[in-house]
Interface confidence: low
């Protein structure tokens, strides 16, 4: 049998390992695809993203929702010839989420 | 130009964003590498691994130290010809992490 | 607040080298973005962009004055150090150094530096 | 390098009238990333440089409202709508927008 302060516990593990948004390290460069001689500094910025477990296999914690966060980085050209710009840069930052089916059945087909 | 109260908020986000143990969400039977038959409920756990960045494109972030800690979790088998079984799960959770080179030169040789 | 404070010799003969340093407070050239400049004005002349270095230690020169010059950074004390080899009296100027932003915010009050013999 | 010339080289000006100072450079100062980086200074007797204006036309904190800065690609002013005594040394231009940053020669600004 199974006492209740056990199944307490693991239903709060559960809870929090469920599919939500949770304060992730993005690398900005690759985030905005930008060009090779151009870098920031700092190279990561913390947003929330979708992450998360999902009940079955078949589905994928996936985002429904999105705002853009302004984050201020120095953006810096290779050579070093300019200042290092201090310039906004927005960042995807998930709102909500959902198990969402990984392949989707073509809804139009 | 900028003003010290702004680097003071780029620097703090950049300490948030470097590489240390986070807590993250842990499929417990792809870790344990168990048959897909032998699955876990809940199927995720947290606890905490290396994760975030490091300055240098050449660097990751890795685990120097790790501890076990025990899940107690439903063992299920397919097909269902037994109760689930709430077992205890050993999980590695990362207690010290550093950015190291991806590819270390041999130290031995 | 920041501050900038530049020291070195009044006075150096020509075809010496001359030694300035840079000793600075309010921030640290270890703080991303950040780079320490030198920049020099003959009396009653233009001012001249000379060096700089940034936090991660790269350096730039004024192309003209590249061969006779030489910047370094010691980050634990808060200076930075610019060589000029093979004064001349043309090179007679005030000397300011700066902290390198965009523009130039801070400035050191300047040290000035005859040649001659 | 980018060549900075200014004119005026000298402004003999009185109290309560309006001033302007002409800044003209070698080449475009649009940088790659859009903004142009030309910059204002004023160096008061035995002083050392002071930002006025910042990217063409942005006062810089503390700086009077009288101070005002115009222009794009090559052509560039700056004005001073009303001069008053503390307004006179000598005002720079300066680019950094290319290496090696340059500055103009200066335009001596003092009370008739």
């Known amino acids: 049998f199974y006492d209740i302060e056990t199944l307490k516990v693991i239903d709060e593990e559960w809870q929090r390992t469920q599919c939500s948004p949770r304060e992730t390290c993005v690398e900005v460069a690759s985030e905005l695809g930008k060009s090779t001689n151009t870098f920031f500094k700092p190279p990561c910025v913390n947003v929330f993203r979708c992450g998360g477990c999902c009940n079955e296999e078949s589905l994928i914690c996936m985002n429904t929702s999105t705002s853009y966060i302004s984050k201020q980085l120095f953006e810096i050209s290779v050579p070093l010839t300019s200042v290092p710009e201090l310039v906004p840069v927005k960042v995807a930052n998930h709102t909500g989420c959902k198990c969402l089916p990984t392949a989707p059945r073509h809804p139009y087909s | 130009f900028y003003d010290i109260e702004t680097l003071k908020v780029i620097d703090e986000e950049w300490q948030r964003t470097q590489c240390s143990p986070r807590e993250t969400c842990v499929e417990v039977a792809s870790e344990l590498g168990k048959s897909t038959n032998t699955f876990f409920k809940p199927p995720c756990v947290n606890v905490f691994r290396c994760g975030g960045c490091c300055n240098e494109e050449s660097l990751i972030c890795m685990n120097t130290s790790t501890s076990y800690i025990s899940k107690q979790l439903f063992e299920i088998s397919v097909p269902l010809t037994s109760v689930p079984e709430l077992v205890p799960v050993k999980v590695a959770n990362h207690t010290g992490c550093k950015c190291l080179p991806t590819a270390p030169r041999h130290p031995y040789s | 607040q920041v501050t900038l404070k530049e020291s070195g010799p009044a006075l150096v003969k020509p075809t010496q080298t001359l030694t300035l340093t840079c000793t600075f407070s309010g921030f640290s050239l270890s703080d991303y973005g950040m780079g320490v400049g030198w920049i020099r004005q003959p009396p009653g002349k233009a001012l001249e962009w000379l060096a700089n270095?940034?936090?991660?230690?790269?350096?730039y020169y004024n192309p003209v004055l590249r061969s006779r010059l030489t910047i370094s950074k010691d980050t634990s004390k808060n200076q930075v150090v610019l060589t000029m080899t093979n004064m001349d009296p043309v090179d007679t100027a005030t000397y300011y150094c700066?902290?390198?932003?965009?523009?130039?915010?801070?400035w050191g009050e300047g040290t000035l530096v005859t040649v001659s013999s | 390098d980018i060549v900075m010339t200014q004119t005026p080289l000298s402004l003999p000006v009185t109290p309560g009238e309006p001033a302007s100072i002409s800044c003209r450079s070698s080449?475009?100062?649009?940088?790659?990333?859009?903004?142009?980086?030309l910059h204002w200074y004023l160096q008061k007797p035995g002083q050392s440089p002071q930002l006025l204006i910042y990217k063409v036309s942005n006062r810089f904190s503390g700086v009077p409202d009288r101070f005002s800065g115009s222009g794009s690609g090559t052509d560039f002013t700056l004005k001073i709508s009303r001069v008053e005594a503390e307004d006179v040394g000598v005002y720079f231009c300066s680019q950094s927008t290319h290496v090696p940053w340059t500055f103009g020669g200066g335009t001596k600004v003092e009370i008739k």
């Open positions: 270095i940034w936090w991660n230690d790269d350096k």
């Open positions: 080449q475009s100062l649009v940088h790659i990333n859009g903004n142009t980086y």
């Open positions: 700066v902290q390198v932003t965009n523009p130039f915010v801070f």
